[in-house]
Interface confidence: low
């Protein structure tokens, strides 16, 4: 009997730049099929617990499961499938119709090049001089990948880096993002967002450690010459970063065009559509670019942005260049002005 | 017959810019983006950059980032690629290559311009 | 960036031998976007093959593509004297673009 669970189970995401995200393919025994989102009994718009395919991730050597659910848009090969059973079971599929399939969407987390610890070290009286110093991004919980208040550990003393507004660390941020595998530095996280507000339910381990750092210097290269340890503050502000690492991205498709690789712009937040509303942080191809990418279409070929003349109109609006920089939508609820992008077409 | 023809060599000081031009014909210019890429003396290629000619959004190669404007002219159809501050590692043949499909690929190439930067 | 290493650098053939060039990449690619080109001295490149075993328009039969992954392989069944030249291979899968260092197939 096929399953996800199967080790000889072969999968595939397609229809974005990552290989851990996408659209799900799988192979039986005459070729790749997309799977609908409508198999298992489920409804097509319905969200599932990602970590039921976890297996699937792990095969294509990817992070955790992130969402696993209805992908942004169908894109139809020659051969979908429903299939029946236990969820994640593929010894009792049909052939679907290509317009009544919904494909089935799964995100895992990219995987990372060294995986640095996830969990804390365990308090100790004994020093440890010879553990290599080390950082940790702590997210919220349900927060997101790469991004968090920075923890920096120095043989078994562990705690926050104390930060000033005024502190000039451009170099610093990006040396720590780097050092976390994460890509480089995007903007510092309000504490709110980073997750420093504690929980009151929230288990002993995850109290604010005994130690904080301060930034010793802001050029270092090497993780023992960053920070000195300081005498924890009640108050002041702690180092909490957002890098490009960061996962979920914010996943984006084109509708209303005449083919897949044009159309108006929307994105997603969550389980929900809507259209992505113009921004003067925008104002150049790289944006349309990564959006035409994850079309698999070819390059922009132009774009125009539509007169939001209905005070109504609304959307999400990111403001960085790059959705890839966005970690954050913002809702507009009037006089959002839409954009239409007409990328290279495959099959022009 | 779709030919991109570039403009001639160019001999520059350190520090200088140098702009070298890609006239597209044979085709629907605003229809395809335009690519350059460069190849030092002996080397192998090196993108740099993209135009979308019907638009003139650029994307380009975070090593030139900064130093590099891309730009079009429809009324002419040509593309334009300016390199500035320029050092003796930028000698190097440019080329311009025209983007075809969903593929990603460069279908017709300029004849190149050799940019020599010398003291 | 995606780093492509073809081998071997120099390939030293006689006309009428078949040609084996190898393109390796340090990160899986998708097979849409591996391509092939040739360039003689003094000449620009020129497109051979596109999506890893597409021909070009003009492009003879006896040049062949295939691969996946991060392996990619162009074939040349008989060298004919006009093959020789240096191929490169190149990469649209990621940002950025990236070229093989190229191999030089030269007359023995």
């Known amino acids: 009997r096929l399953s996800w669970y199967d080790p000889d189970f072969q999968a595939r995401l397609t229809r974005s730049n990552s290989k851990c995200q996408g659209q799900l393919e799988v192979y039986l025994k005459d070729g790749w099929h997309m799977v609908c989102s409508q198999s298992w009994g489920r409804s097509s718009k319905q969200w599932e617990d990602p970590s039921q395919a976890s297996k699937v991730c792990q095969r294509l050597n990817c992070g955790v499961p992130l969402s696993l659910g209805p992908f942004l848009v169908t894109y139809t090969p020659q051969s979908s499938i429903i299939c029946y059973g236990q969820l994640g079971s593929f010894s009792n599929c049909s052939h679907s119709r290509n317009d009544m399939c919904h494909s089935l969407g799964l995100t895992c987390l990219e995987p990372q090049k060294t995986t640095p610890p996830t969990t804390r070290p365990p308090p100790t009286t004994t020093p440890e001089p010879t553990a290599p110093p080390r950082l940790q991004l702590v997210a919220q919980s349900g927060g997101q990948h790469c991004a968090g208040v920075v923890e920096f550990y120095s043989g078994s003393l562990g705690g926050t880096i104390s930060y000033e507004a005024q502190d000039k660390t451009q170099d610093l941020e990006n040396f720590l993002c780097n050092n976390l595998q994460c890509g480089s530095f995007l903007k510092h996280l309000p504490e709110t967002e980073a997750g420093r507000a504690q929980d009151p339910g929230e288990p002993r381990e995850h109290q604010p450690l005994p130690i904080q750092w301060k930034i010793q210097n802001s050029s270092c290269t090497s993780l023992e010459h960053c920070f000195r340890k300081i005498k924890p503050q009640k108050s002041g502000r702690v180092l909490a970063l957002l890098c490009s690492g960061f996962q979920p991205k914010v996943q984006s498709r084109l509708v209303g065009g005449s083919s897949i690789c044009e159309g108006t712009v929307e994105v997603r937040q969550g389980a929900q559509w809507a259209a992505l509303c113009d921004s003067s942080s925008a104002r150049s191809s790289l944006r349309w670019e990564e959006v035409c990418r994850e079309q698999q279409c070819g390059s922009v070929n132009s774009y125009r942005v539509l007169d939001a003349g209905d005070p109504t109109s609304r959307g999400l609006f990111c403001p960085h260049q790059k959705l890839s920089q966005c970690h954050e939508l913002w809702e507009r609820n009037s006089y959002c002005k839409k954009v239409f992008v007409t990328c290279q077409d495959p099959n022009p | 017959q779709v030919q991109l023809v570039q403009s001639g060599a160019e001999v520059k000081k350190p520090g200088a810019s140098v702009k070298v031009s890609c006239k597209g014909s044979?085709?629907?210019?605003?229809?395809?983006?335009i690519h350059w890429v460069r190849q030092a003396p002996g080397q192998t290629l090196e993108w740099m950059g993209l135009?979308?000619?019907?638009?003139?959004?650029?994307s380009y190669n975070q090593k030139f980032q900064g130093r590099v404007t891309m730009t079009v002219d429809k009324s002419t159809s040509t593309a334009y690629m300016e390199l500035s501050s320029l050092r003796s590692e930028d000698t190097a043949v440019y080329y311009c290559?025209?983007?075809?499909?969903?593929?990603?690929?460069?279908?017709?190439w300029g004849q190149g311009t050799l940019v020599t930067v010398s003291s | 960036e995606i780093v492509l290493t073809q081998s071997p650098g120099t390939l030293s053939l006689s006309p009428g031998e078949r040609a084996t060039l190898s393109c390796r990449t340090n990160?899986?690619?998708?097979?849409?976007?591996l391509h092939w080109y040739q360039q003689k001295p003094g000449q620009s490149p020129r497109l051979l093959i596109y999506?890893?075993?597409n021909l070009a328009s003009g492009v003879p039969t006896r040049f062949s593509g295939s691969g996946s992954g991060t392996d990619y392989t162009l074939t040349i069944s008989r060298l004919e004297p006009e093959d020789f030249a240096v191929y490169f291979c190149?990469?649209?899968?990621?940002?950025?673009?990236?070229f093989g260092g190229g191999t030089k197939v030269e007359i023995k």
């Open positions: 290559a025209r983007h075809y499909g969903a593929n990603n690929y460069f279908d017709y």
């Open positions: 135009i979308s000619t019907s638009s003139g959004d650029v």
């Open positions: 190149q990469q649209y899968s990621g940002y950025p673009l990236t």
């Open positions: 999506g890893t075993s």
């Open positions: 990160s899986s690619v998708s097979s849409s976007y």
């Open positions: 044979g085709y629907t210019f605003t229809n395809f983006a």
